[in-house]
């Protein structure tokens, strides 16, 4: 491959190593768990007042929850921090895809059943858009036990 492409890969690799994608994983897991819980009850009934102080001082969020997440400050804060992390990949769509793939791989063992995996994948694809960022055009989020060709 061409030199610049190799340099791009190295830059992406180091960017991925520095990134903290945990808030994205937490945000998505909470989101799909809430969506499962919300069958049979009002999906917008708040489980926590976004302005009430919680035990963790870092969760006192001055914002009302985003339109995508009206159910409590904890997850709203995970979403903001996740979006900050993804914002760093905004100018490198291929690397953004790698970040999304990494989130999928990190959480694949925790997903229970095909339905939850599909739901997680769907939410993951929507994540850049929810952050107000451009989503990668083609991004394979399939996880195979024997590894996979990413492109």
């Amino acid at each position: 491959r061409q030199q610049w492409e190799l340099q791009g890969d190295r830059r992406c690799q180091s960017q991925l190593e520095r990134a903290n994608l945990r808030p994205c994983e937490q945000h998505l897991m909470q989101k799909i768990q809430r969506d499962e819980d919300s069958y049979g009850r009002d999906p917008y009934s708040p489980s926590q007042d976004p302005y009430s102080p919680s035990q963790d001082p870092d969760r006192r969020d001055p914002y009302s929850p985003s339109p995508y997440d009206r159910r409590g400050a904890g997850s709203s804060q995970h979403q903001e921090r996740c979006c900050n992390e993804l914002n760093e990949f905004e100018n490198n769509q291929r690397c953004m895809c790698e970040a999304l793939q990494q989130i999928m791989e990190n959480q694949s063992d925790r997903l229970q059943g095909r339905q939850q995996e599909q739901q997680f994948k769907r939410e993951l694809r929507n994540l850049p858009q929810q952050c107000g960022l451009r989503a990668p055009q083609r991004c394979d989020l399939e996880v195979e036990s024997g590894g996979r060709d990413r492109y």
Epitope: N20, D58, P62, S66, Y68, E80, R81, E85, C131
Partner: antibody, heavy 122, light 110 residues
């Protein structure tokens, strides 16, 4: 409650490097943007630059050649280094958190330190 | 380099209404600059009043409102009070993550 505290020498000699540290307490520094802002006595505020916890930075173009910012997530701290200082760099230096309102690109400073006064003089 | 302009000083009578503006040396200010407004009492750190053109920060009285007026961002204070007397700064968000402060407006409540 998340609090910010600036620290560093109050007096720096001309041509030397000004170094300040901002310590974040009561919450995590991780996955947020952090900034430095300064204010010379009796004058307005000037944005110096921002740093993300991965270490990526954006600087004020007029200061870019002299500014370096760094972050130490293990200590919950981020730092400012300003080289070749002159009397014009005498100011109160503030650190602040920069928030982004998801899913927009609306940014604003929501938390500020109290500021630390730095005088450049021989 | 981009210069963000504000009235150096402005005065208002107690109970009156005043509008502070924030312009650009070249071109018009629009919502895409995500203007925000900060209040600074002498000797203190600034505090956020308005962000994203017109969203009031938590705990800010509704006497403070933000908007775009013509080609400038504007901060309007209605029912001005003695303790509104201080400095006000606007900030515009430029490309590449750069933010620029206006020169500030000193508000006097006469």
């Amino acid at each position: 409650q998340v609090q910010l505290q600036e620290s560093g020498p109050g007096l720096v000699k001309p041509s030397e490097t000004l170094s300040l540290t901002c310590t974040v307490s009561g919450g995590s520094i991780s996955s947020y943007y952090w900034t430095w802002i300064r204010q010379p006595a009796g004058k307005g505020l000037e944005w110096i630059g921002r740093i993300f916890t991965t270490g990526s930075t954006n600087y004020n173009p007029s200061l870019k050649s002299r500014v370096t910012m760094s972050v130490d997530t293990s200590k919950n701290q981020f730092s400012l280094h300003l080289t070749s200082v002159t009397a014009a760099d005498t100011a109160v230096y503030y650190c602040a958190r920069l928030r982004r309102v998801v899913p927009t690109a609306i940014w604003h400073f929501d938390l500020w330190g109290r500021g630390t006064r730095v005088t450049v003089s021989s | 380099q981009t210069v963000v302009t504000q009235e150096p000083s402005i005065s208002v009578s107690p109970g009156g209404t005043v509008t502070l503006t924030c312009g650009l040396s070249s071109g018009a200010v629009s919502t895409s600059y995500f203007p925000s407004w900060y209040q600074q009492i002498p000797g203190q750190a600034p505090r956020t009043l308005i962000y994203g053109t017109n969203t009031r920060s938590s705990g800010v009285p509704d006497r403070f409102s933000g908007s775009i007026l013509g080609n400038k961002a504007a901060l309007t204070i209605t029912g001005a009070q003695a303790d509104d007397e201080c400095d006000y700064y606007c900030v515009l968000y430029m490309d590449s993550g750069v933010m620029v402060f206006g020169g500030g407006t000193k508000l006097t409540v006469l």
